[in-house]
């Protein structure tokens, strides 16, 4: 090989030892039979030389340096070359390192040409392995300006004072040209402008100076990004932390066109504006650090641009200034990750502050849109608490667990309304009326309208789900002994035609000690599943629930259990059953945890089920299925 | 002085398959970098894949799950299978190996993916 740099290039060439590998034969330049392991080429030199091995790029580096010198003279602005050219040297991975310096006063872009440029976080690598390092400096100190990649949306960085490129090709790489210019500008006043270009829809991810250390102390840094005007942008920040600031504030700046609020001053941790019409500005602004713990600036976002959707120019008004005690929240439902790029899809408040989930909260009337290419990615979640403090003013009082309709009016399909009802302890308890009566969700009979109740204990020691329940059985309703949660639940998107069919009322009742009673109505010919509550993980321990159900004067009921013994074991005390006749009072008792299951019985009139658990051992829970068939007195039962 | 010859380039519908194979003479260059790039009509070069001395591979994003590099050390050969064809990847194929620091290239076979 021979490489001569003519002189006043300003080149410096360097031949060095790359990462060390576990190569057992070492490799050596060979000079006039001289082996050595790093060799330094200046501007009038010319050197020739061999290495002593097949492979050399597995153990050497080559760095070609262009320091360029705007200071004492004219700037050589234009497109910058490759030099010496790549033919020229050895198949090293190599590093074109340009490092300009100019005057404060003086501000230097660098153009990209296509393909633009990808930033990329601490641990990433590009796939083609070409990347761009590029680092300002603010008076003696290099500061990073970031690592990018090619196939991007970045196209030019401005910065004054000087600026260090390098470019690192691998040596398999055929790339023949820097790929960008030098031009001079005007003062930019901060440290760095950095301009993104979108095209079409896409995202970028960019990082403050510096990323993952801290940004410079009272710096200001600004990112240009040129959106088509048909074309949405959202900003939302992945990773920041806060410095200790002694004076000013650190925040982020929007300057967005046509927007009569500018600058729109943001700070790290509001969230950020989205649904942006066109181009727009955001800078990143320091403060002055606390001497003795400065901490560190750093942050690191990501600008999503996209179509958008019909939606969003629609408003929905949220009236809950009427409600109390009520959050309903939108938010992403939950999906296997794709690695394809996927449109954002977030929900706006006031059509500016755009989020991939939004919590709205009673007391007021929100304005939602929607930036969504597929507003089935969402869902509602709502949670509303009634609860009564006062035993004497509450008792007998109603309330009608509904949907309200603004509710059911979004075009966001609602996942679950939970209604959590409170009442003074050994005070009140409570009934659940439906307005149609309700079918026990089990395996025996599923349901399958377009929503279920979910009906559990609200007290955080108590682990008790009274079961899923839906319009069209025979329970009439369903009393409780204290704080509960009701969730409504939907299934399909027909529970926009099936809401008609929702509708339960809470009353407090007087205090009763048992934990739930059940009223089941059976209707003629149809079988009523029902089932303990907490099944498959058995009903707690020393806890009494009971069904009270109706026979009709003309019919007869038949009482069947699923299994021939209850596989309860108890640690403690005892588990039993006890069937009850109301007109006569008569009963029969069963030891739960000894006895076998009744078989079949017939019954005439209304009759209770009453069942209460021991402590039973780990594993040998009390679960316990059976069913209700009514038939016709007549029909002859032997 | 090594002289590199591509063959098995030719003709093939999208969604069809093609092994290139490169074969390496006038020294042994078995354990050492070797490369394919391509160059389509009016295109800048692009690299495409390479194998390195210690046989670790490495692809463009462009042919990544498509495209396997390989070597047989024994016969002095590089191959480059090629399955899920695109009409994009149509492009005269050259291989290149390193050797001593030098980058040596053949004259390139030409692939042509068209319905």
């Known amino acids: 090989f021979e490489i001569a740099l003519p002189r006043e290039s300003n080149i410096t060439v360097l031949i060095k030892l790359g990462t060390p590998t576990l190569l057992a034969k070492p490799c050596y330049i060979v000079i006039s039979k001289r082996h050595i392991t790093m060799l330094s080429i200046k501007s009038g030199e010319r050197i020739v030389f061999t290495f002593s091995c097949q492979s050399p790029e597995n153990h050497f580096v080559i760095e070609i340096q262009k320091n360029i010198d705007c200071m004492s003279g004219p700037c050589p602005f234009g497109e910058v070359q490759l030099q010496p050219s790549t033919s020229l040297l050895p198949t090293l991975n190599r590093t074109f390192i340009w490092d300009v310096k100019a005057h404060k006063s003086i501000g230097l872009e660098l153009q990209f040409s296509i393909p633009r440029l990808r930033q990329i976080g601490p641990g990433e690598s590009c796939p083609d392995g070409v990347t761009h390092s590029i680092s300002g400096r603010i008076d003696a100190t290099v500061v990073r300006i970031g690592t990018f990649c090619s196939n991007g949306t970045v196209s030019r960085i401005k910065m004054q004072e000087g600026v260090k490129m390098a470019l690192h090709l691998p040596w398999f790489h055929p790339r023949n040209v820097s790929g960008f210019s030098i031009a001079n500008r005007s003062s930019i006043k901060r440290l760095c402008i950095i301009e993104s270009v979108f095209e079409g829809e896409g995202s970028a991810t960019l990082m403050s100076a510096n990323y993952p250390e801290g940004f410079p102390e009272d710096e200001l840094m600004t990112w240009q990004f040129v959106v088509p005007a048909h074309l949405r942008a959202s900003v939302s920040f992945l990773n920041f932390n806060l410095s200790n600031c002694e004076r000013k504030e650190e925040r982020v700046e929007y300057y967005i066109p046509g927007s009569t609020t500018n600058p729109e001053v943001f700070k790290l941790e509001d969230k950020q504006p989205g649904n942006m019409a066109g181009n727009f500005n955001l800078s990143l602004q320091g403060c002055d650090q606390d001497a003795q713990s400065p901490g560190i600036l750093r942050l690191q976002f990501q600008v999503l641009v996209q179509h958008p959707q019909n939606e969003s120019n629609k408003i929905y008004v949220v009236d809950l200034s009427n409600e109390r005690a009520m959050s309903l929240t939108i938010e992403p439902r939950p999906v296997k990750q794709s690695r394809k790029f996927v449109p954002g899809c977030f929900v706006c408040l006031e059509s500016r502050t755009c989020s991939s989930n939004l919590t709205l909260t009673s007391g007021s009337k929100h304005k939602i849109s929607f930036l969504c290419d597929d507003l089935t990615r969402l869902w509602m979640n709502v949670e509303k608490t009634i609860s009564c403090t006062d035993h004497r003013y509450c008792q007998r009082k109603s309330y009608s667990l509904q949907v309200p309709s603004d509710i059911l009016h979004l075009p966001v399909e609602l996942h679950d309304f939970s209604w959590k009802l409170l009442v003074p302890k050994d005070r009140l308890s409570l009934v659940l009326v439906p307005a149609q009566k309700l079918q026990q969700h089990t395996h025996e009979k599923p349901c399958n309208t377009s929503f279920s109740y979910l009906v559990a204990s609200a007290i955080p020691s108590q682990d008790l789900y009274f079961g899923s329940f839906c319009p069209g059985g025979s329970i009439k309703q369903i009393q409780v002994k204290q704080n509960i949660s009701v969730t409504l639940r939907t299934f399909a998107p027909s529970f926009q035609q099936e809401a008609s069919r929702q509708g339960l009322t809470v009353s407090f009742i007087p205090y009763f000690k048992e934990e739930g009673v059940f009223t089941v109505t059976p209707d003629t010919k149809s079988k009523v599943y029902l089932r303990t509550p907490n099944w498959d993980r058995g009903l707690p321990s020393l806890t009494s629930v009971s069904w009270n159900i109706s026979v009709p004067r003309d019919q007869v009921a038949c009482l069947t259990f699923f299994k021939e013994r209850s596989g309860v074991v108890c640690q403690t005390g005892r588990a039993f059953m006890i069937i009850q006749e109301q007109r006569t009072r008569a009963e029969e008792i069963f030891s739960l945890d000894e006895d076998v299951l009744p078989k079949p019985s017939f019954h005439h009139h209304s009759f209770w089920v009453n069942i209460s658990n021991c402590s039973p051992t780990s594993g040998k829970q009390l679960d316990l299925l059976f069913s209700v068939t009514l038939t016709p007195r007549t029909v002859d039962l032997t | 002085e090594v002289q590199l010859v591509e063959s098995g380039g030719g003709l093939v519908q999208p969604g069809g398959s093609l092994r290139l194979s490169c074969a390496a003479s006038g020294s042994d260059v078995s354990a050492n970098g070797m490369v394919w790039h391509r160059q389509a009509p009016g295109k800048q070069r692009e690299w495409v894949a390479v194998?390195?001395?210690?046989?670790?591979?490495n692809y463009a994003d462009s042919v990544k799950g498509r495209f396997t590099i390989s070597r047989d050390s024994d016969k002095n050969t590089m191959y480059l299978q090629m399955n899920n064809l695109k009409p994009e990847d149509t492009a005269v194929y050259l291989c290149g190996v390193a050797h001593y620091g030098q980058t040596y290239w053949g004259k390139g076979t030409l692939v042509t993916v068209s319905s």
């Open positions: 194998i390195s001395s210690s046989g670790s591979t």
